[in-house]
Amino acid sequence: LIIGFGISGKHFITVTTFTSAGNIGEDGTLSCTFEPDIKLNGIVIQWLKEGIKGLVHEFKEGKDDLSQQHEMFRGRTAVFADQVVVGNASLRLKNVQLTDAGTYTCYIRTSKGKGNANLEYKTGAFSMPEINVDYNASSESLRCEAPRWFPQPTVAWASQVDQGANFSEVSNTSFELNSENVTMKVVSVLYNVTINNTYSCMIENDIAKATGDIKVTDSEVKRRSQLQLLNSG
């Protein structure tokens, strides 16, 4: 969370940004809020990126002004125009690229004053794992699979019954490059599993951490998977 103050004469406004992460190939959001101003025509939003000449995006007088937009962002940006009056200056970024990572500035000018704040935007790939019982193996095993990660993550297994146990000797993890030659598919197999136990497969890089849980009993199979972005907010 970054809060910036701007001073214009006696006036300043608070601008707030949140460190966020973009999943390459998908759409992302660079979050920025400011003190609302009901006078839409008096609001100017400028997004800038460190090391890039020209603007990432500009919104003024109630509409986009892309005359100074840098070509790497052409056709890929939009603000939430209907939410500007309530103080939302967040930027939607289409088809996130690895090269979109960096430091961005959200600059705001309203009739109340002006202000800006920086945000760090990380890019990579992250996805939820699917965890399944693998009957193909010679002994009952669990297969944890996640389709898109970058940079290469670490993979670890844990179990509710054997807390603190090291499963590296009884698991096998592979990384397979996807067709676009950047992201990788992660597959990890845990061998010799027992029923009535909850197992967790944890996949983590510097951007995200994903966990898949599975509990197998004689009468039911319960699965969960979740993902959290790291260092955001």
Partner: antibody, heavy 130, light 107 residues
């Protein structure tokens, strides 16, 4: 969005094996994230989950049918199949193939997956009678 | 297996009415519940998942709420195309089970 079409005999004799195939179009059966499911509905009654299969071969069956059910996948034909053996009149039903997919929802700490049956075939009626 | 009980099993209502259907789970399932609509001779259609998340393309007059063991599906203003049978389904674990259904008919 994937589309599903069931096929197979509409009439099966008691004690024989019911065999149905589901053909997947507008999507690959071997892409991850989908569980290929079978669900049935007895005449005028509610829905019963039979089981599903993941492209890697992992299967999950309803314990009440497990001893009689086999679900398999043929990635080369983009199809998955249901076999239910030793059928009786109680197996007369409309059989649906469906996809179970993980749909993510936002949580305070990130995202969580909810596995939901979101695409269904049109259903095929199977009658068990001699 | 987790049992789901729906109430009422039959409901008679008029266009414009607010309709509420309840589903009880035999054990706590957090928010792992979905709602489906089925019309005669057709496959069920997903309306809501995660107890309250509206599936893409479903009209906003449909809403879901609840957590744990008690869940509700609400249709804020019943439309002619809403006369159908509604099922709840838990997403908590295998085997998946469905409620017995609620048939919504024209009064």
């Amino acid at each position: 969005q994937v589309q599903l079409q069931e096929s197979g005999p509409g009439l099966v004799k008691p004690s024989q094996t019911l065999s149905l195939t589901c053909t997947v179009s507008d999507g690959s059966i071997s892409s991850g994230g989908y569980y290929w499911s079978w669900i049935r509905q007895h005449p005028g009654k509610g829905l019963e989950w039979i089981g599903n299969i993941y492209y890697s071969g992992s299967t999950y069956y309803n314990p009440s049918l497990k001893s009689r059910v086999t679900i398999s996948v043929d990635t080369s034909k983009n199809q998955f199949s249901l076999k239910l053996n030793s059928v009786t009149a109680a197996d007369t039903a409309v059989y649906y193939c469906a996809t179970e997919k993980a749909l993510a929802t936002v949580t305070p700490s990130g995202y969580e997956n909810y596995y939901t049956v979101d695409v269904w075939g049109q259903g095929t009626t199977v009658t068990v009678s001699s | 297996d987790i049992q789901l009980t729906q109430s009422p099993s039959f409901l008679s209502a008029s266009v414009g009415d607010r309709v509420t259907i309840t589903c009880w789970a035999s054990q706590g399932i957090s928010s792992y519940l979905a709602w489906y609509q089925q019309k005669p001779g057709k496959a069920p259609k997903l309306l809501i998942y995660a107890a309250s998340t509206l599936q893409s393309g479903v009209p906003s007059r449909f809403s879901g709420s609840g957590s744990g063991t008690e869940f509700t599906l609400t249709i804020s203003s019943l439309q002619p195309e809403d006369f159908a049978t509604y099922y709840c389904q838990h997403l908590n674990s295998y085997p998946l089970t469905f409620g017995g259904g609620t048939k919504v008919e024209i009064k």
